[in-house]
Every structure is written in structure tokens, then in C-alpha cells.
């Protein structure tokens, strides 16, 4: 092990301590240890021990109880089907090793629900769904069994119960007790049984919350979404009037650590931005506990649905605030969102009926003060008249989901907090910050909004076309004259955007080369097409050799893009997706979106650029103020513009203006950057505003880019908002919703 | 267009009791609270209590409990209150008003004045 | 039982110039949502009272904006930019945090 055997912070000594076959770690400044093993085995007996007050560690003990002399690793294995009715499965084992499967059949007169077959997975929990034999003879479905559990209680008529139970020494998560309900479903949720050492991984917990979140925040026709014989799946019509509030709680106790707590924010941080991108305005709540709460944000201010505020309020807070009161009271923080929700008797506000909670709870696990929580969850189910009335049980307007974090995590209480919906899972267990974090960052992007433009995922794992999922190469071979490089942007899943001078009239679609999504392949080519106003000599009578006025194209693509975390859209201008993106009003106009993206000012910008094999973002600046009329005479600079009496002939009102040394000193463009997108990146989103066209210095002469480069350095890039028109007739059958 | 009508102005002799109404119209019944507000010649306005149309629960001020009785009429849309064992302190205008959420008592009746005498 | 205090009368005002008419209450009429639950009422002479302010600072629907609201959690102030004549009336302020909800005594809008 890697720890040196003195005596921890604590007062345990650490000898003998070892675990055969992997390693520990120390928590809470050594009051506790954790066992650590290798993937596919598991701390025995136990996976954690507390230092206890007589100066040894506890005892390890399996669950019957039998005292073990030291802690090994084990084989991970599976849980057996303890019953499986109305059918048959094989093999029949006492356990299940890794990758092992099994399927399931049933009798005659029974249909197969749920996986036939399964597979042991490496955290111990079988792959797919619990296997159901079901004839459809009981008014609900049989719930089934899930592997682990037992069932008691065969009757599925209305109103009938059933239970189930876990081994000794496993957790049950979910309900307890399912009830059968009008309408045919069952109260609650599916059970599974739980080992100490079992974790949710990423993916699992990503999917799963994002799936129940999405239930509750997609305005969805509850008439809609199922077909014959389908189970209806909790859907809302998100009344206009309806509202929506998330109470943010994060436990800021001693145990959670500087590091943890910052890692949770940032989870956070990305959930307000996936809630932001679905194009709901909820209300936010943001409370931080240890001994006691503090209210950070409260639903009733003003600014507590604007999403950009609450996120500056969050990365606010400093882990040190409960530093001197570092119990852990989940009551009390429980209490703050009650407080929050609560009104006077019989002054309910306005559309309280119509407002939905959403609770995320986010702890390391066990409350040590002030009593139970679920009193104040029980309070809460009060106050939103949830369960009271059979015909209208209300249970769609609270949602609590409780992230628990680490291995000291109590499982029966945070089980007990969450939310028990029919097909969603509420309660989640991961490893550690790290995992939660994967968890926010794979939300972020989950197949749902893979189509909304501008979305990246910034995660610390990501690759370069994680970050610029727009970005595509372009390159034309020319025979015996080499071959020219270009930059393009995806703006739909047929076209993409790029400038017209990286081709000639005489080069054919087959020796043009598009690729995404930092794909090998090339994509094949349908048509580019130029905009009728490019003429590259257009000019060369006045004595301007090269004229770049109206310098985009489109390549329209023979097959349509399958989106992805590395392959997906840029936001254009005057679009639907760009008003949703800067969460402007529905009633947007083109103008004011101009006006949110091109102030008349310097305008922060970017595009990107290959380095060395590696894509990176420039950061420059728009001059669209003062400095506009200075950037654009250096045009005469440029090669071949120097006899150009008037700069106005060469840099059309089609041009923005990048470059130079004020405000600070902007990278330049190279010759390969051409066609790329100039970007805005406002409110977590990407918007293109331009196409690189042309620089009037050649700074990356011998593949090398220059480091000093003179301050008469510009670039010029083709303004969207100018050729709107054109943009618009070519894209109008990709959906993207033109103002 | 919402409205609020209440009975007509009753002359009753002490110890006997009134039972006066406010007729709803222009909304749902059922979905607001219906309040009664006493205001005696010249003096402020004083809250009797209020009922929920919807299943006929009723809270009162505990300076009027055992004096005022809240009833609702769902058929007709109509809330009654009732006044017992009258004395001259209870000579006053009676308002009913209806109580839109937190937005306060945005619609009121005209007012059923009751005069308690001898 | 939150106790409301007006005082009977405003201090005499000319049309088109600006009145304040104040109100205080025993408690805190600041909720824990963030709410503060005090209303405004005017009952002009021989009318039922109608709804000027709810929860302090909100006009009520029809109200002029003449008419704004403040205050803190006890002390709150009616303001009527420019008085006309249509203003002329009882004042009252209510409370609606605790039951039994409570009027204040009524101010009485004088006019020079």
C-alpha cells in the first residue's frame, strides 16, 4: 500500500490494515479507509472501516456476521435469479463470473418482456432489463423480479400489493412495495438489490437521470408517444402558465473535500446548461449545507431564471464558507427548499398547482445531525398537495434525485429521499467526483440534443473535434498543381459552409475531399455551390487582381450526417437554433440578433485553426467599433492592393475585420484557415459569424506561423448577416427555422 | 366579465339571525376561495373568514367563530353566510370578495348592509 | 393577531402633485419565499374597496401606474405620483402573511 504506517491524522494505527490484492486510501483525515481492488474484483468483507474512539479500526465482518482476520480482493461475480416465474432460464448457477450469460425462455401461453438474454457486467450487475413471463391476465403487467430481489405476492388486480426483498447484507434500491393503479400501472419504481461495493457507472447514470429529467422538463402531448400495447410513459404537457423550479443542494460538509465540492459545481454548472438548452426558463434554488444551510439563490429573485446569473452565483461559492460548521445536516438543508416553496395558508401564488420541483440533491452520505430528511420530504408532498388525491395524485410535480458520491454513502437513506417514478431511476451511487463529473459531461450531450447547434462538449477527456464538432477539412486535389487546403463548418446535416475561393470552376465534385468529426474517411460530394455574386476577377480591369466580394460556397454532401459528440452543427445567424442558443425571447428578430452578436465595438471572436496536426482556438477580436475604419484601410497592405485608391473597392460592407494589436494582439489566419468559421461563443454556445476569406499578410509562410507579425496584419472574413439571402434559399429545406 | 351580487339589505331584531348570499358569475366557482369582510359604520374593514367552493371547507377568524357560518351552493354558484344570535355590534356592511391567489381580494361584492334593531 | 396602523388622515394634497400614504404592521410581513405579503386598497366614498397593490410593489390589474408600493418588511408606503380627482378615498392596507388577515385603521386622502 502506498501509505507510510505511522499513525493517521486520526488515532488508528495503519498496521495490519492491508488489503491482499489492492490497495486503501484514507477519508475524513483518516477517521475512515477505503479499500480499493482492480476492475472486476471487490473489497471483502467490506469496503470501508471507521477509526473508532478506542484507537482500532472497525472489525471486518461478513454479512453473517463471521469475523474475517484481513480484507482481500475478490472476484466480482453476479447475483442469481432467486425465483423466475411462469418460465425458465439457463444456465442455473449459485453465482455468475464476469461476462458470463444467461437467457431466459418462457412456458406456453407467456410472452417474453424486458432482455432474453443477460450478461454479467464488470460492477456485478446484470446487462439489460429484468425478464418478465407475463400471459396479460392481471388489470397491471407482472412487474417481475428483478435479479437479486424476491417477490412476494402474485395477485396484479387493482389496487393489489406486491413486496420485495433483498439477501442479507444487499440494499434495496427503488420501492419496496409496488402498487397496481388505475390505468394499469405500478406505483413507485423496479427494485434492484444493491451491494456495497455496486457503483452506477457514468453512462448508466447519464442516461437514466437525463431520461427521467427529459420527462419532466419536455413539453410533450400526454396523448402522444405511445403505440398499442406500449406502456405510456410519464409524459407532461408543459402548460404555457406552468413554471418550473430546480432547487440545487450540495453539501458542503467536511467529508466532501475542496476538490469534491468544486467538481460538484461544475456537474452543476453543466446541468443549468443542459436545462438551458432544452429552451426552458426554470426557476433555481441553490442551497449549500453542512451544519446549516445557506441560501444562495432563492426562487423568488428576479434574476433566478436567468441561467447565466445562477451559474456566476454558483462558481461563486467558496467550500470555505462552512468551514466552522461542518456536520451535516441534510434536514435542515431540506428545510431551505421547503422554505423556498412555501407561501401562507390560502395565498398560494399564482400557478403553485402548475409549478413543478425538481429537488437534485448532491451528498457524500450520511447525515449526522438534525434528524431525518424524509420528514421534511413527507412536509414537502404536503405543501404540493402530492398524494393526497387518488384521481390526482399530482406525483408529476416533485421529482427528488439524490447523487451520492463516494463509498461512505448510506444507500438506505439516500434511497429513502428519492423520487420512485414507474421506469425512471432517481437515486444514484457513483464512485467518485471524477465519474460525476463524466456523469454532467455525457448528459450534456445526450443523443436528444445532438442536434442543437453550437453545443460542445468541453470535457477533459474530449479530443479536438469534441471541441469543435463543426470544424471540417477540405482539401482539392488538383492534378500536377498539388492540392489546396481549406477549413469548412457543418451547418446542417447536408451542407457545409466554407468559402469559395478554395475551389475553380473546373474542379470536379470527386477531387474535392470534405472530412468530419476527425474521421479517415471522406465524405462524397454532391455539388458546391458558389454565390452567384463571387467573381475572383471581377476586379481585374480596375487593376485588382484578386477580388473576394461575396467569397462563400456550400458543399452539399451525396449522404446525410449522422450527428454525434465530434459531428455536429454550428449555429447560423437569423436561425431558430441561434435564438434558442442565446436564449433570446421566441419573438426574436434577425436585427436584434445581429445586434446581440455584432455590436457596433470590438467583438470577441475565434476561429480555428490546424496546428501541427492539432486543431486550436484562436482568439481575436471583431473591430465592429471605432477601430473598424483603421482595420479595413490596411487592407492596402495587402499584396496586389497597393495602386487601390479607394480601400472601399476591395473591402465590400460584405467584410468584418479581424487583427492587429488593439485591443490586444490578435493571432492571425493561414492560408489552410480559409473558409473556416469566425466564431462568437456566448452562453456556453457557438454562433458563426463569418467565413475567413483573406489576410493581407502571409504569416505562416514555411508552415511555420510567425510570432511577430507587423500591426498592419489583418484578416477578412465573409459577414453571414450579409449574405442571409443566399444562405437562405440554399438551406431552406434543412429545418433550420430562418427568421 | 366577473361579478360578484349580494343580497339585499335585512332589518333584524337581536338574537335572531340572518342569512344573506353572493351570487358568482363570469368564472369558475370552484377554483377561488370566496372571503367575507365586515365593515361597521364608518370603522375599517374586518375579515370574517373565507370557503373553498370546491368541497366546502370553511376558516374563520376566531373573533367570529360560533357567530358566522360559511355555506356554498355549487348548483347555483352561490356562497351564504349566515349571522346568529345578532346584537347591535353586528349592525354593518358585509362584503363578500373573491381571493385570487396571492393577488389578493380582486373582486368584491357590492355590499348587504344589515341593521340589527329593537 | 399581526397588527396593521394607519394614520386617519393624509396630510392635505393639490391634484397633480404627489401623496404618500404610510402603513406599518407588528411582524415581519416578509416571507421565507421572498415574498412580503402586504396589499393596498382604496374604497372610494360609497363604493366597495378595490385592489390598488398586492404583495407590496405589484399593480393590480387597471391600476394606473400612478400608484407604486414599496417598503420593507414593517414599514410601507402607498405613493400616488400625481393625485386626481378620481383618487379620493379610504386607504386601507392589509396584511396576508398570517391568518386572520388584517386591515389597517384606513387613511383618508385629503385634497387642498
Known amino acids: 500500500t502506498p501509505w507510510s504506517l505511522a499513525r493517521p491524522q486520526g488515532s488508528c494505527s495503519l498496521e495490519g490494515v492491508e488489503i491482499k490484492g489492492g490497495s486503501f486510501r484514507l477519508l475524513q483525515e483518516g477517521q475512515a479507509l477505503e479499500y480499493v481492488c482492480p476492475s472486476g474484483f471487490y473489497p471483502y468483507p467490506v469496503q470501508t472501516r471507521t477509526c473508532r474512539s478506542t484507537g482500532s479500526w472497525s472489525t471486518l465482518k461478513t454479512q453473517d456476521q463471521k469475523t474475517v482476520r484481513k480484507a482481500e480482493c475478490r472476484a466480482i461475480h453476479c447475483p442469481r435469479p432467486h425465483d423466475f416465474e411462469n418460465g425458465e432460464y439457463w444456465p442455473r448457477s449459485p453465482y455468475y463470473n464476469v461476462s458470463d450469460e444467461i437467457s431466459f425462455h418462457c412456458y406456453d401461453g407467456y410472452t417474453l418482456r424486458g432482455s432474453a438474454n443477460r450478461t454479467c457486467q464488470v460492477n456485478g450487475r446484470w446487462s439489460g432489463q429484468t425478464a418478465i413471463c407475463d400471459n396479460g391476465a392481471g388489470y397491471c403487467s407482472n412487474p417481475g423480479i428483478p435479479i437479486g430481489t424476491r417477490k412476494v405476492g402474485s395477485q396484479y388486480r387493482l389496487e393489489d400489493s406486491v413486496t420485495y426483498h433483498c439477501s442479507r447484507g444487499l440494499t434495496l434500491r427503488g420501492s419496496q412495495r409496488r402498487t397496481c393503479q388505475e390505468g394499469g400501472s405500478w406505483s413507485g419504481t423496479e427494485p434492484s438489490c444493491q451491494d456495497s461495493f455496486m457503483y452506477d457507472t457514468p453512462q448508466e447514470v447519464a442516461e437514466a437521470f437525463l431520461s427521467s429529467l427529459t420527462e419532466t422538463i419536455e413539453g410533450v402531448d400526454a396523448e402522444d408517444g405511445h403505440g398499442p400495447g406500449e406502456q405510456q410513459k410519464r409524459k407532461i404537457v408543459l402548460d404555457p402558465s406552468g413554471s418550473m423550479n430546480i432547487y440545487l443542494v450540495l453539501d458542503g460538509s467536511d467529508s466532501i473535500g475542496a476538490s469534491n465540492f468544486t467538481g460538484a459545481k461544475k456537474c452543476l454548472v453543466n446541468l443549468i446548461e443542459k436545462v438551458a438548452s432544452y429552451g426552458v426558463k426554470p426557476r433555481y434554488g441553490l442551497v449549500t449545507y453542512a451544519t446549516y444551510p445557506k441560501i444562495w439563490v432563492k426562487v423568488s429573485e428576479a434574476d433566478s431564471s436567468n441561467a447565466d446569473w445562477v451559474t456566476k452565483q454558483l462558481n461563486e461559492i467558496n467550500y470555505e464558507d462552512h468551514k466552522l460548521k461542518s456536520g451535516t445536516n441534510t434536514k435542515k438543508a431540506l428545510q431551505a427548499v421547503y422554505s423556498m416553496m412555501s407561501w401562507p395558508d390560502d395565498v398560494p401564488p399564482e400557478g403553485w398547482n402548475r409549478t413543478r420541483h425538481v429537488i437534485i440533491l448532491m451528498t457524500d452520505g450520511l447525515h449526522n445531525m438534525g434528524g431525518d430528511p424524509i420528514t421534511v420530504i413527507d412536509e414537502i408532498r404536503d405543501l404540493l398537495y402530492i398524494g393526497k388525491d387518488r384521481k390526482n395524485p399530482r406525483e408529476d410535480y416533485l421529482d427528488v434525485y439524490v447523487f451520492g458520491v463516494g463509498p461512505l454513502v448510506n444507500q438506505v437513506n439516500i434511497n429513502a429521499l428519492a423520487s420512485k417514478k414507474d421506469n425512471e431511476q432517481h437515486v444514484f451511487k457513483v464512485k467518485d467526483m471524477e465519474n460525476l463529473e463524466d456523469v454532467f459531461y455525457q448528459m450534456i450531450d445526450e443523443s436528444q440534443s445532438l442536434s442543437l447547434c453550437g453545443m460542445v462538449w468541453e470535457h477533459r477527456k474530449g479530443t479536438d473535434y469534441h471541441k469543435q464538432p463543426w470544424q471540417a477539412k477540405i482539401s482539392v486535389i488538383r492534378p500536377s498543381k498539388g492540392h489546396e487546403s481549406c477549413m469548412g463548418a457543418v451547418v446542417s446535416e447536408y451542407f457545409v459552409l466554407t468559402a469559395a475561393h478554395c475551389f475553380t470552376v473546373d474542379d470536379k465534385e470527386h477531387s474535392i475531399k470534405v472530412s468530419v468529426g476527425g474521421e479517415k474517411r471522406d465524405l462524397e460530394i454532391e455539388v458546391v455551390l458558389f454565390h452567384p455574386n463571387y467573381n475572383i476577377n471581377g476586379k481585374k480591369e480596375a487593376g485588382i487582381p484578386e477580388f473576394y466580394d461575396y467569397d462563400v460556397a456550400l458543399i452539399k454532401l451525396k449522404n446525410k450526417l449522422k450527428y454525434g459528440q465530434t459531428i455536429r452543427p454550428i449555429c447560423l445567424p437569423c436561425t431558430e437554433g441561434t435564438t434558442r442558443a442565446l436564449r433570446l425571447p421566441p419573438t426574436t428578430t434577425c436585427q436584434q440578433q445581429k445586434e446581440e452578436l455584432l455590436p457596433a465595438q470590438d467583438i470577441k471572436a475565434l476561429f480555428v485553426s490546424e496546428e501541427e496536426k492539432k486543431l486550436t482556438r484562436k482568439e481575436v477580436y471583431i473591430k465592429n467599433g471605432d477601430k473598424k475604419g483603421s482595420c479595413e484601410r490596411d487592407a492596402q497592405y495587402a499584396p496586389g492592393y497597393d495602386k487601390v485608391k479607394d480601400i472601399s473597392e476591395v473591402v465590400t460592407p460584405r467584410f468584418l475585420c479581424t487583427g492587429g494589436v488593439s485591443p490586444y494582439a490578435d493571432p492571425n489566419t493561414c492560408r489552410g484557415d480559409s473558409g473556416g468559421p469566425l466564431i462568437v461563443h456566448k452562453r456556453s454556445r457557438f454562433i458563426q459569424v463569418g467565413v475567413i476569406s483573406w489576410g493581407v499578410v502571409d504569416v505562416c509562410k514555411n508552415q511555420k506561423r510567425q510570432k511577430q507579425v507587423p500591426a498592419h496584419a489583418r484578416d477578412f472574413h465573409i459577414n453571414l448577416f450579409q449574405v442571409l439571402p443566399w444562405l437562405k434559399e440554399k438551406l431552406q429545406d434543412e429545418d433550420l427555422g430562418f427568421l | 366579465e366577473v361579478q360578484l351580487q349580494q343580497s339585499g339589505p335585512e332589518l333584524v331584531k337581536p338574537g335572531a339571525s340572518v342569512k344573506m348570499s353572493c351570487k358568482a358569475s363570469g368564472y369558475s366557482f370552484t377554483d377561488y376561495l370566496m372571503n367575507w369582510v365586515k365593515q361597521s359604520h364608518g370603522k375599517s374593514l374586518e375579515w370574517i373568514g373565507r370557503?373553498?367552493?370546491?368541497?366546502?371547507?370553511?376558516f374563520y377568524n376566531q373573533r367570529f367563530k360560533g357567530k358566522a357560518t360559511l355555506t356554498v351552493d355549487k348548483s347555483s354558484s352561490t356562497a351564504h353566510m349566515e349571522l346568529r344570535s345578532l346584537t347591535s355590534e353586528d349592525s354593518a356592511l358585509y362584503y363578500c370578495?373573491?381571493?385570487?391567489?396571492?393577488?389578493?381580494?380582486?373582486?368584491w361584492g357590492q355590499g348587504t348592509l344589515v341593521t340589527v334593531s329593537a | 393577531d399581526i397588527v396593521m396602523t394607519q394614520a386617519a388622515f393624509s396630510n392635505p394634497v393639490t391634484l397633480g402633485t404627489s401623496a404618500s400614504i404610510s402603513c406599518s404592521s407588528s411582524k415581519s410581513l416578509l416571507h421565507s419565499n421572498g415574498i412580503t405579503y402586504l396589499y393596498w386598497y382604496l374604497q372610494r366614498p360609497g363604493q366597495s374597496p378595490q385592489l390598488l397593490i398586492y404583495?407590496?410593489?405589484n399593480l393590480a390589474s387597471g391600476v394606473p401606474d400612478r400608484f407604486s408600493g414599496s417598503g420593507s418588511g414593517t414599514d410601507f408606503t402607498l405613493r400616488i405620483s400625481r393625485v386626481e380627482a378620481e383618487d379620493v378615498g379610504v386607504y386601507y392596507c392589509?396584511?396576508?402573511?398570517?391568518?386572520?388577515?388584517?386591515f389597517g385603521g384606513g387613511t383618508k386622502l385629503e385634497i387642498k
Open positions: 392589509a396584511q396576508m402573511l398570517e391568518r386572520p388577515w388584517t
Open positions: 370557503i373553498n367552493p370546491y368541497n366546502g371547507d370553511a
Open positions: 370578495a373573491r381571493l385570487e391567489n396571492d393577488y389578493g381580494f380582486t373582486y
Open positions: 404583495r407590496m410593489s
